[in-house]
Interface confidence: low
């Protein structure tokens, strides 16, 4: 028996369901009584789900997994993983035994989009050209780690005096805080872009500093 899986990682959003595809080619006359199917974590061999002795043995993974029982006899051994968590990320092995056996691994990449950045300014009043100001761009609840880019009003990248920190919360999602220190000109716009490298999702935030009080562009 030959097992086939997707070579590309499966990308799943946190709290959505994911399907880890696995298939085999049953011989003529194949019955489910012959099938021994095991899904396990590749690194640790922890059991995730199994089908043995002609029946679905159920989830060994917090009751969040399921097979496609009506499709098994056709050779579809895919696994449904419900309510995906960051901690589900990794490699899963599909093991199929009928008379001989084969196995293959499929990677699950978990992702979560970053929120629209919030911008803060320090100090935020009595600003004059030549003042040093600190602009903080904060974006929340994303995964995996973000890439952060700063630009000025002309679209010129700002790379000096930027400090970015990323902290994982209890769910493993990252909160991103990027700090830009700049010397004010007469006026100017500063924008940050928080990019999720897996989703290719960009979240934008910007702040405009003029001779008048600080203004934020309206929410899109």
């Amino acid at each position: 028996v030959e097992v086939q899986v997707s070579e590309d990682p499966v990308v799943a959003l946190v709290d959505t369901d994911a399907t880890l595809r696995c298939s085999f080619s049953p011989e003529p006359g194949f019955s489910l009584a012959q099938l021994n199917l095991i899904w396990q974590l590749t690194d640790t061999k922890q059991l995730v789900h199994s089908f043995t002795e002609g029946r679905d043995q159920g989830s060994a993974y917090s009751n969040r997994t399921a097979l496609f029982p009506d499709l098994l006899v056709q050779g579809n051994a895919s696994l449904r993983l419900q309510r995906v968590r960051v901690t589900d990320e990794g490699s899963y092995t599909c093991f199929v035994s009928i008379q001989d056996f084969d196995s293959a691994a499929v990677s699950l990449q978990v992702a979560a989009p970053y929120s629209k950045p919030s911008m803060t300014l320090e100090p935020n009043k009595d600003l004059r050209p030549g003042n040093m100001v600190t602009i903080t761009c904060s974006s929340y609840q994303g995964y995996p780690e973000a890439e952060v880019f700063w630009k000025d009003g002309q679209g010129v990248p700002l790379t000096g005096n930027v400090t970015t920190s990323q902290m994982a919360n209890e769910r493993g999602l990252f909160d991103v805080h990027s700090v830009l220190r700049v010397v004010l000109g007469a006026n100017g716009t500063y924008s940050c872009l928080v990019r999720n490298p897996v989703l290719q999702q960009d979240a934008h935030g910007s702040v405009t500093i003029t001779g008048q009080p600080l203004t934020f562009p309206p929410e899109a």
Epitope: A60, S62, D88, S91, S107
Partner: antibody, heavy 119, light 113 residues
Framework: EVKLQESGPGLVKPSQSLSLTCTVT?????????WNWIRQFPGNILEWMGY???????SYNPSLQSRISVTRDTSKNQFFLQLNSVTTEDTATYYC????????????WGAGTTVTVSS | DIVLTQSPSSLAMTVGQKVTMSCKSS????????????LAWYQQKPGQSPKLLVY???TRESGVPDRFIGSGSGTDFTLTISSVQAEDLADYFC?????????FGGGTKLEIK
């Protein structure tokens, strides 16, 4: 706030069994994560002993496989370590520890309990 | 089993100095599927439990000061304290979280002069 608290006898005789309890508060051990036992020998060497996952499956260090059992009581939100046929070499501080899912790094540690094996 | 070797076994530094300590693995800890290195660093102050500082070789745990910097890939890893403080007096351990059995290095003891 998550807390892990080890308890059990501080003195065990050679050839007997060592039994420890970890009581978890602030988080259900059936919700997520792996719940581990790690010990630290005199001289500060750390050894991972094994875990029981939130789904109830266990994995052990092969060096202890024949002597170790990690079980749990979900109604009390506790998990347990049993180590059989102890020798003086099992004298150590024993920690119960939570690891983030399958990532196997250790984010929450109990305070530890010292067990001396001596006759 | 994966063996982790830490060096030096001890070092004494003065407040404000930069500290580097090494952890070498007997096997590659880089997971090619996600390009992450499965190595963690812990700090253990006298009389306390170990505390997670860094995982995946360079990701700082929440609340850890940014003077603690993890780096490296494959088999060679480094923990740097950019400007050591008196409260950093502790033992530091590396741990591979690549595969079971999970293993730790022998530790580096940091003393403050």
């Amino acid at each position: 706030e998550v807390k892990l608290q080890e308890s059990g006898p501080g003195l065990v005789k050679p050839s007997q069994s060592l039994s420890l309890t970890c009581t978890v508060t602030g988080y259900s051990i059936t919700s997520d994560y792996a719940w581990n036992w790690i010990r630290q020998f005199p001289g500060n060497i750390l050894e991972w002993m094994g875990y029981i996952s939130y789904s109830g499956s266990a994995s052990y260090n092969p060096s202890l496989q024949s002597r170790i059992s990690v079980t749990r009581d979900t109604s009390k939100n506790q998990f347990f370590l049993q180590l059989n046929s102890v020798t003086t070499e099992d004298t150590a501080t024993y920690y119960c520890v939570r690891s983030l899912g399958r990532r196997w790094y250790f984010g929450f540690w109990g305070a530890g309990t010292t067990v001396t094996v001596s006759s | 089993d994966i063996v982790l070797t830490q060096s030096p076994s001890s070092l004494a530094m003065t407040v404000g100095q930069k500290v580097t300590m090494s952890c070498k693995s007997s096997q590659n800890l880089l997971n090619s599927s996600n390009q992450k290195n499965y190595l963690a660093w812990y700090q253990q102050k006298p009389g306390q439990s170990p505390k997670l500082l860094v995982y995946f070789a360079s990701t700082r745990e929440s609340g850890v000061p940014d003077r603690f910097i993890g780096s490296g890939s494959g088999t060679d890893f480094t923990l740097t304290i950019s400007s050591v403080q008196a409260e950093d007096l502790a033992d530091y351990f590396c741990q591979q979280h690549y595969s079971t059995p999970l293993t730790f290095g022998g530790g580096t003891k940091l003393e403050i002069k």
